[in-house]
């Protein structure tokens, strides 16, 4: 008996050949006996099956002696022996439907769980595998779960369904729904404009939600919310902004902030939350402000850093064109007595320079000036 | 073709009111924000107010919050500026203008209100 | 709210010439900014939006460039029809602001 695996919702056509190459009479049978089809000259006939409205053959074939049976729009209760009767012989054809589900919406949270479920006929053993798009392959029989999805997961699955060595392939677009970064960091010397961005890693047609930027400054005993805003099919309304500082919010995705300028008490990490319709959890993206002052008080020349710094992040004041004076792992470095010049303090990470702030040393009698 | 007429301005005196009418045709009004920027004789261009597809948000500019009230009637294709305690420093030409998102894109050809005693 | 600082107020050039006229926003605005054309009389037109991006039907000769806070409208040669007021508009939030405007007029 011939085996042929379908999927929920497809087309199959199964093939019945007469060995006379010509329109003979051919009927299709399921395993009930029950007419489905057939011929009368060149005329296709019907019978009283279920699949009445579904079935089909194709006309154009009957010339060569080819008498397919065409199911559309499959389901898994299709799954049948159907039986071809032409020329005194049958042909038998047992036909598997197999459906592939997301159980939930193909659009989930990161860090969400994805189960995918096989419908299967009764009497069937499949074995299913899925490949994700960032090539992890996972096996399992009725159910596939995948916990912790993360930004990677987005994209085709393929899987693939095994039954009596063939096999039937689905594909399922995943839309993991989170920012593209979990995590950033800007530096900005004291004084600079600063201009946080969310871009979103994933494009829908409608999006709708709510979110909340919290900020925790260094120096703050406790966090503050800045901002709170609505996303209506992807434009941006300001509900409440926090006066100081003076955040500026686009109207427009992806999600874009800017703060005045960057100063010391502003220095900290901040969460952005976005509650979006309809899910349940959240997105986050943390940002991290880090802030650098340099300043001359009479013979103390201080260079300072506020913020979320690595323990490996360099600290340094050199004189232009010269090797560093003082260079230290933590937040602030001084050089008392400086001499006379362009003094440049720099904060860096394994010789790459995150930060720059350059204040001219004026001859003693002088006032320093900071470019 | 795509088309904004405006009506309704004319000569008040100081602390009336009026109500300015801008009729959309062309395209789907109901799918757009919609705006209604100002200019004074000789001076700029000054954005009034813009009003949400379905009428639930309106942004003002300072000058006018509490005043000026902006409206939509999807049903008619109509966008309506209704100003109340008029000065003399509202005198100017008003345009409705269609809000594409990304850019004020199109523009009615205008209609002056005076505010004189 | 976000200021705009357009310059220069006023241009004298010639046909063929290439004009550049700047639009400063006193916060970062990305490429919220679009460009409009005024003629005497007559209503603006769009020609720019989204900084860099060439309304439809627009000629070719205007561009714009920039992002953040510094944006550049640049007609590559003028025509006697460009002689006009041009405006930059930020609509990156409300209120959406206008800069105060540059007259070209023929030298």
């Known amino acids: 008996k011939k085996v042929v695996l379908g999927k929920k919702g497809d087309t199959v056509e199964l093939t019945c050949t007469a060995s006379q190459k010509k329109s003979i009479q051919f009927h299709w049978k399921n395993s009930n006996q029950i007419k489905i089809l057939g011929n009368q000259g060149s005329f296709l006939t019907k019978g009283p099956s279920k699949l009445n409205d579904r079935a089909d053959s194709r006309r154009s074939l009957w010339d060569q002696g080819n008498f397919p049976l065409i199911i559309k729009n499959l389901k898994i209760e299709d799954s049948d022996t159907y039986i071809c009767e032409v020329e005194d012989q049958k042909e038998e054809v047992q036909l598997l439907v197999f459906g592939l589900t997301a159980n939930s919406d193909t659009h989930l949270l990161q860090g969400q769980s994805l189960t995918l479920t096989l419908e299967s006929p009764p009497g069937s053993s499949p074995s299913v595998q899925c490949r994700s798009p960032r090539g992890k392959n996972i096996q399992g029989g009725k159910t596939l779960s995948v916990s912790q999805l993360e930004l990677q997961d987005s994209g085709t699955w393929t899987c693939t369904v095994l039954q009596n060595q063939k096999k039937v392939e689905f594909k399922i677009d995943i839309v993991v729904l989170a920012f593209q970064k979990a995590s950033s960091i800007v530096y900005k010397k004291e004084g600079e404009q600063v201009e946080f961005s969310f871009p979103l890693a994933f494009t829908v047609e409608k999006l709708t939600g709510s979110g909340e930027l919290w900020w925790q400054a260094e120096r703050a005993s406790s966090s503050k919310s800045w901002i709170t805003f609505d996303l209506k099919n992807k434009e941006v309304s300001v509900k409440r902004v926090t006066q100081d500082p003076k955040l500026q919010m686009g109207k427009k995705l992806p999600l874009h902030l800017t703060l005045p300028q960057a100063l010391p008490q502003y220095a900290g990490s901040g969460n952005l939350t976005l509650a979006l319709e309809a899910k349940t959890g959240k997105l986050h993206q943390e940002v991290n402000l880090v802030v650098m002052r340099a300043t001359q008080l009479q013979k103390n020349l201080t260079c300072e850093v506020w913020g979320p710094t690595s323990p490996k992040l360099m600290l340094s004041l050199k004189l232009e064109n010269k090797e560093a004076k003082v260079s230290k792992r933590e937040k602030a470095v001084w050089v008392l007595n400086p001499e006379a010049g362009m003094w440049q303090c720099l904060l860096s990470d394994s010789g790459q320079v995150l930060l720059e702030s350059n204040i001219k040393v004026l001859p003693t009698w002088s006032t320093p000036v900071q470019p | 073709e795509v088309q904004l007429v405006e009506s309704g301005g004319g000569l008040v005196q100081p602390g009336g009111s009026l109500r300015l009418s801008c009729a959309a045709s062309?395209?789907?009004?109901?799918?757009?924000?919609m705006t209604w920027v100002r200019q004074a004789p000789g001076k700029g261009l000054e954005w009034v107010a813009n009003?949400?597809?379905?009428?639930?948000?309106?942004y003002y500019v300072d000058s006018v919050k509490g005043r000026f009230t902006i409206s939509r009637d999807n049903a008619k294709n109509s966008l309506y500026l209704q100003m109340n305690s008029l000065r003399a420093e509202d005198t100017a030409v008003y345009y409705c203008?269609?809000?594409?998102?990304?850019?004020?894109?199109?523009w009615g050809q205008g209609t002056m209100v005076t505010v004189s005693s | 709210a976000i200021q705009m600082t357009q310059s220069p107020s006023s241009l004298s050039a010639s046909v063929g010439d290439r004009v550049t006229i700047t639009c400063r926003a006193s916060?970062?605005?990305?490429?919220?900014l679009n460009w409009y054309q005024q003629k005497p009389g007559k209503a603006p037109k769009l020609l720019i939006y989204?900084?860099?991006s060439l309304q439809s039907g627009v000629p070719s000769r205007f561009s714009g460039s920039g992002s953040g806070t510094d944006f550049t409208l640049t007609i590559s040669s003028l025509q006697a029809e460009d002689f006009a007021t041009y405006y930059c508009?930020?609509?990156?939030?409300?209120?959406?602001?206008f800069g105060q405007g540059t007259k070209l007029e023929i030298k």
């Open positions: 203008v269609r809000d594409r998102y990304d850019a004020l894109d199109i």
């Open positions: 062309g395209f789907t009004f109901s799918s757009y924000w």
């Open positions: 009003i949400k597809q379905d009428g639930s948000e309106k």
């Open positions: 916060q970062g605005i990305r490429n919220d």
């Open positions: 989204a900084a860099s």
């Open positions: 508009l930020k609509d990156y939030n409300y209120p959406y602001t």
